[in-house]
Amino acid sequence: AVNGTSQFTCFYNSRANISCVWSQDGALQDTSCQVHAWPDRRRWNQTCELLPVSQASWACNLILGAPDSQKLTTVDIVTLRVLCREGVRWRVMAIQDFKPFENLRLMAPISLQVVHVETHRCNISWEISQASHYFERHLEFEARTLSPGHTWEEAPLLTLKQKQEWICLETLTPDTQYEFQVRVKPLQGEFTTWSPWSQPLAFRTKPAALGKDT
């Protein structure tokens, strides 16, 4: 929901967390603000305190339950409000009717590990974290490999258009240090976006055998 120079953006991690960012030009720094979640078909509601992340933006996480609980479904609609304290009362600064499964951002993949490494290739696996079973296999991944002397931004993106929690990296240089990252996105949801990148996994290819061409 955008209100003048105010922007209120939230994502559901598909299980028990809604993360929100609210930005507003000229907002008072000392004001206490919170996000309030009111589902249309649940008996519970939840709030979180907005904390500053930059000069004009605040963020918070609505914890809806245990991390792997399925607290919302495709039919839920959650009214999300930004409330800021004005004296003794709360003022509504932004509001949106939030459809959780139209606004998905999963947790970053975890448990990255090298399954097998050779001189020119490396097989890497990972796991998805706190992802709803609703997706079944309807997920896609992007991966990138950091080569020596390059930046992450320069790394070409490898796309996996299916739920495949491994990759075999080819054409690597022997005896070279690399880093690898992966992110995940459900196919569902009009405003769904990529998860954060995973923590980088460092690995080194094996040296070429002596006396052999590389």
Epitope: A16, R42, W44, G65, A66, D68, S69, Q70, K71, L72
Partner: nanobody, 116 residues
């Protein structure tokens, strides 16, 4: 359907402790997460603590470090150990269970009153 029955509420002085219990019956195999919510004078039902079938937990900010949630899957029971109770913890405490499909089940609630 899942039925939930809470017990353990009561009147306690500030600084004291209480242990709430909740027993699930019925279609217990469908239960994933179990949780405690509380509803105070503002009539809002908010999360106190939650625990998944495999033991992952989450707590409301106001109770972190004071309350501990635990679960015995074999007994279909969830507990809430409440220490260092404050008057602002006074509320009706509700047991909640959520299914793998996202359905919510609720107990009838148990009153906790903390006097100063």
């Amino acid at each position: 359907q899942v039925q939930l029955q809470e017990s353990g509420g009561g009147l306690v002085q500030a600084g004291g402790s209480l242990r709430l219990s909740c027993v699930a019956s019925g279609s217990v195999s469908s239960i994933n997460g179990m949780a405690w919510y509380r509803q105070g004078a503002d009539n809002q039902r908010v999360l106190v603590a939650a625990i998944s079938r495999v033991g992952n937990t989450a707590y409301g900010d106001s109770v972190k470090g004071r309350f501990t949630i635990s679960r015995q899957n074999a007994r279909n029971t969830v507990y809430l150990q409440m220490n260092s109770l404050k008057p602002e913890d006074t509320a009706v405490y509700y047991c909640n269970a959520d299914s793998w499909g996202g359905d919510d089940y609720w107990g009838q609630g148990t009153q906790v009153t903390v006097s100063s």
